[in-house]
């Protein structure tokens, strides 16, 4: 049996009666189709549920949607379809929730055969809606200015760019022939345009534009653009090089006023770049291999986004579906996992604890045996199922899960061997950010983190049978107890809990099926009476993140500092509470050469921590030189890793060299640029949010 499912393990007494009093069923009076859920605001308890049912009849689709609202975390729902005049809402655009706690909601209606469209707007957490007819048909979901929820941006199906300054009441077209538009910082809008009006055929001939005043004035900041993307403080553009179909990445950190060429390989038309993760300090960039290989290379940048270090070879990223298993483990600083496609075509999971500096296999869970994929039954690793496994149809109900406020916790489906197995996966947990793992539950499950990690819940995936049991753990997955939430099982479709993992409520969604119809049903369980008391100081213990060797006085040092956290004791059954704030104490570490990356023109020989000057700069390295301003070209060979806070210790001081004399290429010189361009080059394209997977900052 799975660990902790034995009888003597249970720590919570008399939980059945407590949970029974806090289990709320809601049956939805409509046919089963699809359901979209959205939490409106943080800690408000307001949830919107949009059910849609569509039937294709000949050439048209007949549809019906219903809108429900809860203000008690899903315990009760009220049908508010009449507030939107029983209009059919486009489920592909979902429910657009305003940033922060603005209480704003936008629903986009499907108005067949119309030259315009219709939206329903709410500013009061969906208590009331205002119907507004649009002078255009949106091509994608309307987006809020992240810093001002009254300002909206929309792209029409005729490639017009529209802006509203009064939360969708009045709209103004600010540009035409727009291919893609994105909000930048401080209300800036970046977009690509093509005067030919074609966005797909003429990629590579686009212009990148910027407006900082919502369309009053514009600036062309790049030409010969293939695509663009934003990540952290960086604006990236892939630009045609003038050498056939090759393109290169250029980067700007000043909103596109000036550009530098990134020291990355150029790619051909069948390849792509993708920003896997970015913040204000650095970026993880995937560069696809030539051909239909299904893999590429991850590079990590310096703080300028210009110099890149090779981080991981053979990184799995399918060209076809755009699947990558790259995941930011948000419960511990510097930790990321992803998959590689090994030489033998097997897929293996890798993990980095130092922001891409080094990658290793995941440690084998102590309570697991190596499976059939392992050559040596005593030596193998844990391999995690993520987006690629889900895309290939394996029985993996959920992606790996971590939360910033549930420090150190990672939940994931996986298998233990030499590579990912196609066999039925189990659920594994790490309580130290991925350093060590334990098998937590046998077989595939849906799972959620509640109360900042003080409570875990799980429901077994069972496609052929109804579900009426939920499992919960108050000790980070060591021990599990089961609660039967209904006598009448439901066909379970998913778990839902408020984003942020602060709630103690979880909803189980599913449907009941009879001979003639199927109905949506939800069960919301409030665990507040299980965690009866508020946690006190004595319930927390000091935990050192990234600890691998307690006897080393550099233990826990990652990127130049270590962090001690106050973490809830596994044995404490109490509420962290909604207002819980992670308590952490950082301490600076002494510098070593590991805290520095090699600057442009330098490299690290294998198994050496010193940066050595490259004998000569070849190929694309020469091209990089031309656009670097002088400060980019003077270097002592070392540059501190982005985000590294070390002090003292090793200070790699050596002669500062001017590398300009090594730059001999006349690649794409600025005077040959289109006069509209304000930098050496610019870029455009698409920031994709790959839902059901993870947030990819930009995929061309």
């Amino acid at each position: 049996s799975a660990p902790g499912e034995d009888e003597e393990c249970g720590r919570v007494r008399d939980f059945v009666a407590k949970l029974a009093n806090n289990t709320h069923q809601h049956v939805f009076d409509d046919l089963r189709g699809s359901v979209s859920l959205a939490w409106v605001g943080d800690g408000t308890g307001v949830i919107l549920a949009l059910t849609t049912f569509q039937v294709p009849i000949f050439m048209i689709t007949i549809g019906q949607s219903k809108l429900y609202r809860s203000e008690d975390y899903g315990k009760n729902f009220k049908d508010i379809t009449d507030l939107i005049n029983n209009t059919f809402i486009r489920s592909d655009f979902g429910i657009a929730i305003g940033p922060e706690n603005s209480g704003k909601v936008i629903l986009t209606a499907d108005v067949s055969g119309s030259h315009g469209s219709r939206i329903f707007r709410s500013s009061d957490f969906a208590k009331n809606f205002v119907q507004t007819d649009l002078p255009f048909v949106p091509l994608m979901q309307i987006t809020y200015n992240p810093e001002n929820s009254n300002v909206l941006l929309a792209l029409s199906n005729k490639n017009e760019l529209w802006v509203s300054k009064n939360f969708g009441g009045k709209w103004e077209e600010i540009h035409d022939t727009v291919c893609l538009a994105k909000w930048g910082r401080k209300g800036t809008i970046f977009f690509t345009a093509n005067h030919n009006g074609s966005c797909s055929n003429d990629r590579g001939m686009l212009e990148l534009w910027r407006t900082s005043d919502l369309g009053k004035s514009f600036k062309t900041i790049g030409v010969k653009i293939y695509s663009f993307g934003l990540g952290g403080k960086f604006l990236f553009a892939s630009v045609m090089t003038g050498k056939g179909t090759l393109r290169r990445i250029h980067v700007s950190t000043d909103q596109g006023d000036t550009w530098s060429m990134a020291q990355l390989p150029s790619v051909g038309h069948e390849q792509f770049y993708s920003i896997l993760a970015a913040n204000d300090e650095m970026v993880f960039m995937h560069v696809d291999e030539p051909g239909d290989s299904g893999f590429g290379t991850i590079f990590t940048s310096d703080d300028r986004g210009i110099v890149y270090s090779k981080s991981l070879d053979r990184h799995l990223y399918t060209t076809t579906g755009g699947e990558t298993d790259f995941i930011n483990v948000t419960s511990l600083r510097g930790v990321f996992t992803t998959s590689i496609l090994a030489e033998d075509k097997s897929i293996q999971t890798m993990i980095t604890f130092d922001q891409g500096g080094r990658w290793t296999h995941l440690r084998k869970p102590e309570n697991s045996e190596c499976d059939a994929t392992a050559k040596n039954k005593n030596e193998c690793s844990l391999h995690i199922h993520a987006a690629y496994s889900i895309a290939t149809g394996l029985n993996v109900p959920m992606l790996p899960l971590s939360e910033p406020n549930a420090v150190g916790l990672v939940l994931a489906h996986g298998s233990v061997g030499d590579a990912i197995s196609v066999m039925r996966p189990d659920v594994y947990i790490s309580d130290d950010g991925g350093y060590s793992w334990t098998k937590m539950l046998e077989g595939p499950h849906h799972y959620a983190i509640l109360d900042s990690g003080g409570l875990l819940v799980a429901v077994e995936q069972n496609a052929h049978q109804g579900v009426n049991v939920i499992k919960f753990s108050t000790d980070e997955g060591q021990c599990w107890q089961t609660y039967t939430f209904t006598r009448d099982p439901i066909f379970f479709t998913g778990l839902a809990s408020e984003p942020g993992a602060r709630s103690m409520n979880v909803s189980l969604w599913g449907y009941r099926s009879s001979l003639f119809h199927q109905q949506w049903v939800s069960y919301t369980i409030d665990f507040k009476d299980i965690l009866e008391r508020n946690c006190e100081e004595k319930d927390y213990t000091i935990w050192l993140a990234h600890s691998t060797d307690p006897e080393d006085y550099e233990d826990g040092c990652i990127l130049g500092y270590k962090e001690q956290f106050l973490r809830l004791r596994k044995s404490s059954v109490c509420q962290n509470g909604r207002d819980y704030v992670v308590t952490k104490q950082p301490s600076i570490c002494l510098c070593s050469l590991e805290d520095f990356l090699c600057d442009f023109g330098y490299y690290r020989p294998e198994n050496d921590s010193k940066c050595v000057e490259q004998p000569e700069l070849k190929g694309h390295d020469l091209e990089f030189c031309l656009y670097g301003r002088e400060e980019h070209l003077t270097t002592n060979g070392y540059r501190k890793i982005p985000g590294d806070k070390c002090q003292g210790g090793v200070n790699p001081v050596r002669e500062v060299k001017d590398l300009k004399k090594k730059c001999t290429s006349n690649f794409l010189s600025p005077e040959k640029q289109n006069s509209k361009s304000n930098g050496s080059a610019g870029g455009s394209g698409g920031l994709n949010d790959i839902f059901e997977a993870q947030k990819i900052e930009w995929h061309e």
């Epitope: 000091i542 307690p550 006897e551 080393d552 006085y553 233990d555 104490q585 301490s587 600076i588 002494l590």
Partner: antibody, heavy 120, light 107 residues
Framework: EVQLVESGGGLVKPGGSLRLSCAAS????????MNWVRQAPGKGLEWVSS????????YYADSVKGRFTISRDNAKNSLYLQMNSLRAEDTAVYYC?????????????WGQGTMVTVSS | EIVLTQSPDFQSVTPKEKVTITCRAS??????LHWYQQKPDQSPKLLIK???QSFSGVPSRFSGSGSGTDFTLTINSLEAEDAAAYYC?????????FGGGTKVEIK
């Protein structure tokens, strides 16, 4: 009973050498980092040196670096401090102390100390 | 080097009175601060580790608090046997350092 007993102190001339020993009992010596801490007469505590359980990590205070050598023999449950080129300012009671098993842990067990006097 | 500044240097207190000793670090040391008691002609004894965790066998009148750079040792109701020197010690960064000590005397 958990115990640390220092020995080897005494009077030595400046520039001379001395070897201190610390005998451990009542716990698994080979599992713990060990330390030497000294206290000059009428003064406060000063950390001198540290050695990890398997001698992988050895650390010294700047004031003794290059002159003192810490070592251990896990088979004999013993800790040592070889002191060379002794100076008057090395005069102190030298304590052997066990470090707890946690990261950045405290010195949880101390010996009774042995007096080292450096004088001509 | 992380410098630990202890205050006061000396305190003369009547029995049952509350004693507060502070220790300030020159830079953040997280929770890696420990308190020791040293009675005359004896070796130091650990009282509090990791800023606030009482060591086994230590009377409950001794407590510690703080994190980062500011730490406090409190003796809630002083007893005659508590006359001693008290030292703070940081283990966050090499070289390991101690505060200058606080001598507590019974009035």
């Amino acid at each position: 009973e958990v115990q640390l007993v220092e020995s080897g102190g005494g009077l030595v001339k400046p520039g001379g050498s001395l070897r201190l020993s610390c005998a451990a009992s009542g716990f698994t010596f080979s599992s713990y980092s060990m330390n030497w801490v000294r206290q000059a007469p009428g003064k406060g505590l000063e950390w001198v040196s540290s050695i990890s359980s398997s001698s992988s990590y050895i650390y010294y205070a700047d004031s003794v670096k290059g002159r003192f050598t810490i070592s251990r023999d896990n088979a004999k449950n013993s800790l040592y401090l070889q002191m060379n080129s002794l100076r008057a300012e090395d005069t102190a009671v030298y304590y052997c102390a066990r470090r707890g098993s946690g990261s950045y842990d405290a010195f949880d067990i101390w010996g009774q100390g042995t007096m080292v006097t450096v004088s001509s | 080097e992380i410098v630990l500044t202890q205050s006061p240097d000396f305190q003369s207190v009547t029995p049952k009175e509350k004693v507060t000793i502070t220790c300030r670090a020159s830079q953040s040391i997280g929770y890696s601060l420990h308190w020791y008691q040293q009675k005359p002609d004896q070796s130091p004894k650990l009282l509090i580790k990791y800023a606030s965790q009482s060591f086994s066998g230590v009377p409950s009148r001794f407590s510690g608090s703080g994190s980062g750079t500011d730490f406090t040792l409190t003796i809630n109701s002083l007893e005659a046997e508590d006359a001693a020197a008290y030292y703070c010690h940081q283990s966050s960064s090499l070289p390991l350092t101690f505060g200058g000590g606080t001598k507590v005397e019974i009035k």
